[in-house]
Interface confidence: medium
């Protein structure tokens, strides 16, 4: 099942997704789409990066982290109940037969009477840990393995549970990290 993240109406939601570029500036294209990752590309694309920059985005969707270092986590500004659903982060690794795909479930809760700070997120789950294995996981799952075609030395998922979402550094630990090179 999808990894689940929560936010309140009016807050900014955060959906983590990471990879490690093989070298500085050697970026991998990424697309974010609303809906589960399809077989090809992203459905209902809301944001896309190429090897240099963010080359497509829609209002309220942006990358708050340093995508040039592989932090392609999606921020959705001022969320409403309509933003609930599955989002696809697709890391479009060239030169292999399949991309890496992550389905993340965003649950929007009604605003509390006393609104929480807009930067605070409530994470309810994180990606399961999996060590590298020969070959890579099925396209529809979040379990990943090694991709020797691109000299991928490590694909790992970190943090079974994100315990303190108030610390910015902890945000990185909640996502899938792909290390290339």
């Amino acid at each position: 099942s999808e990894v689940e993240y929560r936010a309140e109406v009016g807050q900014n939601a955060y959906l983590p997704c990471f990879y490690t570029p093989a070298a500085p500036g050697n970026l991998v294209p990424v697309c974010w789409g609303k809906g589960a990752c399809p077989v090809f590309e992203c459905g209902n694309v809301v944001l896309r990066t190429d090897e240099r920059d963010v080359n497509y985005w829609t209002s309220r969707y942006w990358l708050n982290g340093d995508f040039r270092k592989g932090d392609v986590s999606l921020t959705i500004e001022n969320v409403t109940l309509a933003d609930s659903g599955i989002y696809c982060c697709r890391i479009q690794i060239p030169g292999i037969m399949n991309d890496e795909k992550f389905n993340l479930k965003l649950v929007i809760k009604p605003a509390k009477v006393t609104p929480a700070p807009t930067r605070q997120r409530d994470f309810t789950a994180a990606f399961p840990r999996m060590l590298t294995t020969r070959g890579h996981g099925p396209a529809e799952t979040q379990t990943l393995g090694s991709l020797p075609d691109i000299n991928l030395t490590q694909i790992s998922t970190l943090a079974n549970e994100l315990r303190d979402s108030r610390l910015a550094n902890d945000l990185r630990d909640s996502g899938a990290t792909i290390r290339i090179g």
């Epitope: 294209p29 077989v39 090809f40 590309e41 694309v45 037969m97 399949n98 396209a139 529809e140």
Partner: antibody, heavy 115, light 110 residues
């Protein structure tokens, strides 16, 4: 190395059926999406169908919808295309191609639909 | 009728640079990546360029892809006789939920 070998082509009458197979080797078949693409004699490439690694997602070209069925058996490292209600315009070389980027192609199998 | 539009033929002399165009729409070329395939006579298609116009291993750097808006192109430099082949562009169409191909361009080395 990665290899795809198609089989099952042949001569069939209009309205008949054929089942094409694609045997995969040299890679973890169960991890990859797979595709069928065809090429009519003297014509260009035409995508036919795609299936995701665990068969959760399946797509068909409008020209074959309702007549062709794509499937796979990951235990046997095999991809299939069941073709029913065949028409003359289905005459083509059928290729299987692997992955999200259709990187690797088989050598093709010829399907001829003629009375 | 192919969804992507390519010129039916192109030609050049040995050593020359030739460019093949591929025109689509916002739902395919404009949104998604364009792939180029080479099909030598009597053989299966072979992937030449893919994501970010990069080449798979074994494909010489004489082949380079590019894209601008809803149009893409394949440039072949240092033309050789063994590059006489049909060249196809392809992209995933988000609206059709289908792979779409160009009609193919037959390259002749004069």
């Amino acid at each position: 190395q990665v290899q795809l070998v198609e089989s099952g082509g042949g001569l069939v009458k209009p309205g008949g059926s054929l089942r094409l197979s694609c045997a995969a080797s040299g890679f973890t078949f169960s991890s990859y999406s797979m595709n069928w693409v065809r090429q009519a004699p003297g014509k260009g490439l035409e995508w036919v169908s795609s299936i995701s690694s665990s068969s959760s997602y399946i797509y068909y070209a409008d020209s074959v919808k309702g007549r062709f069925t794509i499937s796979r058996d990951n235990a046997k490292n095999s991809l299939y295309l069941q073709m029913n209600s065949l028409r003359a315009e289905d005459t083509a070389v059928y290729y299987c191609a692997s992955g999200d980027h259709m990187d690797v192609w088989g050598q093709g199998t010829t399907v001829t639909v003629s009375s | 009728q192919p969804v992507l539009t390519q010129p039916p033929s192109a030609s050049g002399t040995p050593g020359q640079r030739v460019t093949i165009s591929c025109s689509g729409s916002s739902s395919n070329v404009g949104t998604n990546y364009v792939y180029w395939y080479q099909q030598l006579p009597g053989t299966a298609p072979k992937l030449l360029t893919h994501i970010n116009n990069q080449r798979p291993s074994g494909v010489p750097d004489r082949f380079s892809g590019s894209k601008s808006g809803t149009s893409a192109s394949l440039a072949i430099s240092g033309l050789r006789s063994e590059q006489e082949a049909d060249y196809y562009c392809a992209a995933w169409d988000a609206t059709l939920s289908a792979w779409v191909f160009g009609g193919g361009t037959k390259l002749t080395v004069l």
